[in-house]
């Protein structure tokens, strides 16, 4: 086992049945938000499969936040009787592997990969940059790891940490950044400043992903790209918190090396994007 392998593996004490989430937001990490209040709230922990308490700061955060333990349980847990342990090989894959490729409605054409259930292989497609569905991967390897069967009929690798697109927005995820960090913010935070083609000189800010800071630039008033903010605060809020240290709190669970690796299987809620 290399260190890199372990970094991307979720290891748990016991064999758990596949986790089928009732709502995709139940997979979000607990997010206390940027504010400083101390409010007792509850979130669903996908690793322990239980609703747990956390301290919420009072603003922002995400949907995996509930006023009471009961509300959390109602939204994110199923009765054990209703938990169907999937056994067939086809069902080992996440549900989204069986969705048709969907380029989405936007026009920022990006090369992505999808699992083609007809050919049983991951294939390239052009993604428009927004919406679409979860059968959409940045790399061929990622697609193969999550959706293709290995030579012995089992999944090639675990996908327990593939939680960066758990809603149906499928906004562009990042290109790769230095190894200690992962970028989970909008992909345009990684693009260079672009003045655009007009003649105005508007004061704007862009996120410089090399130095990790928001910097001013002069915007021409039209065109350019999305890495363009009217204030430094806006820029920081959109891009700065996208950089997450892999070893920070809420990161990956690690225990002793020799335990059996367990994939955390997550079946996302249906998104209702159909091919006609």
């Amino acid at each position: 086992d290399s260190e890199e392998d372990e970094e991307h593996t979720i290891i748990t004490d016991t064999e758990l049945p596949p986790l089928k989430l009732m709502h995709s937001f139940c997979a979000f990490k607990a997010d206390d938000g940027p504010c400083k209040a101390i409010m007792k709230r509850f979130f669903f922990n996908i690793f322990t499969r239980q609703c747990e308490e956390f301290i919420y700061g009072g603003c922002e955060g995400n949907q995996n936040r509930f006023e009471s333990l009961e509300e959390c349980k109602k939204m994110c847990t199923r009765d054990n009787a209703n938990r169907i342990i999937k056994t067939t090989l086809q069902q080992e894959k996440p549900d989204f592997c069986f969705l048709e490729e969907d380029p989405g409605i936007c026009r920022g054409y990006i090369t992505r990969y999808f699992y083609n259930n007809q050919t049983k292989q991951c294939e390239r497609f052009k993604y428009g940059g927004c919406l679409g569905n979860m059968n959409n991967f940045e790399t061929l390897e990622e697609c193969k790891n999550i959706c293709e069967d290995g030579p012995n009929g089992f999944q090639v690798d675990n996908y327990g940490t593939q939680l960066n697109a758990v809603n149906n927005s499928l906004t562009p995820q990042s290109t790769k950044v230095p190894s200690l960090f992962e970028f989970h913010g909008p992909s345009w935070c990684l693009t260079p400043a672009d003045r655009g083609l007009c003649r105005a000189n508007e004061n704007r800010f862009y996120y410089n992903s090399v130095i990790g800071k928001c910097r001013p630039f002069k915007y021409s008033g039209c065109g350019g790209n999305e890495n363009n903010f009217t204030s430094k605060q806006e820029c920081l809020r959109a891009c700065k918190k996208g950089f997450i240290q892999r070893i920070s709190k809420g990161g990956l669970i690690k225990t002793k090396r020799k335990r059996k690796k367990q994939r955390v299987k997550i079946a996302y809620e249906e998104i209702f994007v159909k091919n006609m």
Partner: antibody, heavy 124, light 107 residues
Framework: QVQLQQSGPGLVKPSQTLSLTCAIS??????????WGWIRQSPGRGLEWLGL?????????AYAVSVKSRITINPDTSKNQFSLQLNSVTPEDTAVYYC??????????????WGQGTLVTVSS | DIQMTQSPSSLSASVGDRVTITCRAS??????LHWYQQKPGKAPKLLIY???TLQSGVPSRFSGSGSGTDFTLTISSLQPEDFATYYC?????????FGQGTKVEIK
Amino acid sequence: QVQLQQSGPGLVKPSQTLSLTCAISGDSVSSNSGGWGWIRQSPGRGLEWLGLIYYRSKWYNAYAVSVKSRITINPDTSKNQFSLQLNSVTPEDTAVYYCARYLGSNFYVYSDVWGQGTLVTVSS
Amino acid sequence: DIQMTQSPSSLSASVGDRVTITCRASQGISSYLHWYQQKPGKAPKLLIYGASTLQSGVPSRFSGSGSGTDFTLTISSLQPEDFATYYCQQQNGYPFTFGQGTKVEIK
């Protein structure tokens, strides 16, 4: 200049099918630059997105969960128009229905052109 | 679904006033937010897309800001033709959802 012209009946009986058409001028229903959709507005519900279609070498659609089992949006390339069908209507479906063009930029999609609106009343 | 909450639901202002309308999303939506203006009996009209980009032909007195969960539409100097209802709408994921609207009335 893109324009959308809506047509269809203003009165539909409960349990029947609501059918509206949106004729496009100045753009093509098969355009690769965006899509076409329907939104409705009622005093009780405000503005409610119903669904959209778009063409990217084949047709795709996305529907609101609230109407998913009852809705169909279809393109008609020969007439350069698209239609809304909403089955099994009830008085709660009474609203002003708008068709709209969804323009897709690099990362955004927004309704930049709207039809004039059609008040549809569901009543026996 | 992502809930969009606008405040205030209505406001009274005079010509020349600076008006600010806020929109809050129930979860982070980056800058996938658009603003529309609607006058009685008319279809909504796009003002701003992507939280801060002014739609072509819209006067520069309109501006938008924000990202994540909190967004603002500002009219720097209210004109007679600006008395209308304003809606925010998210595009972060299906279904697209709108705020309940903010009605700007003459004081």
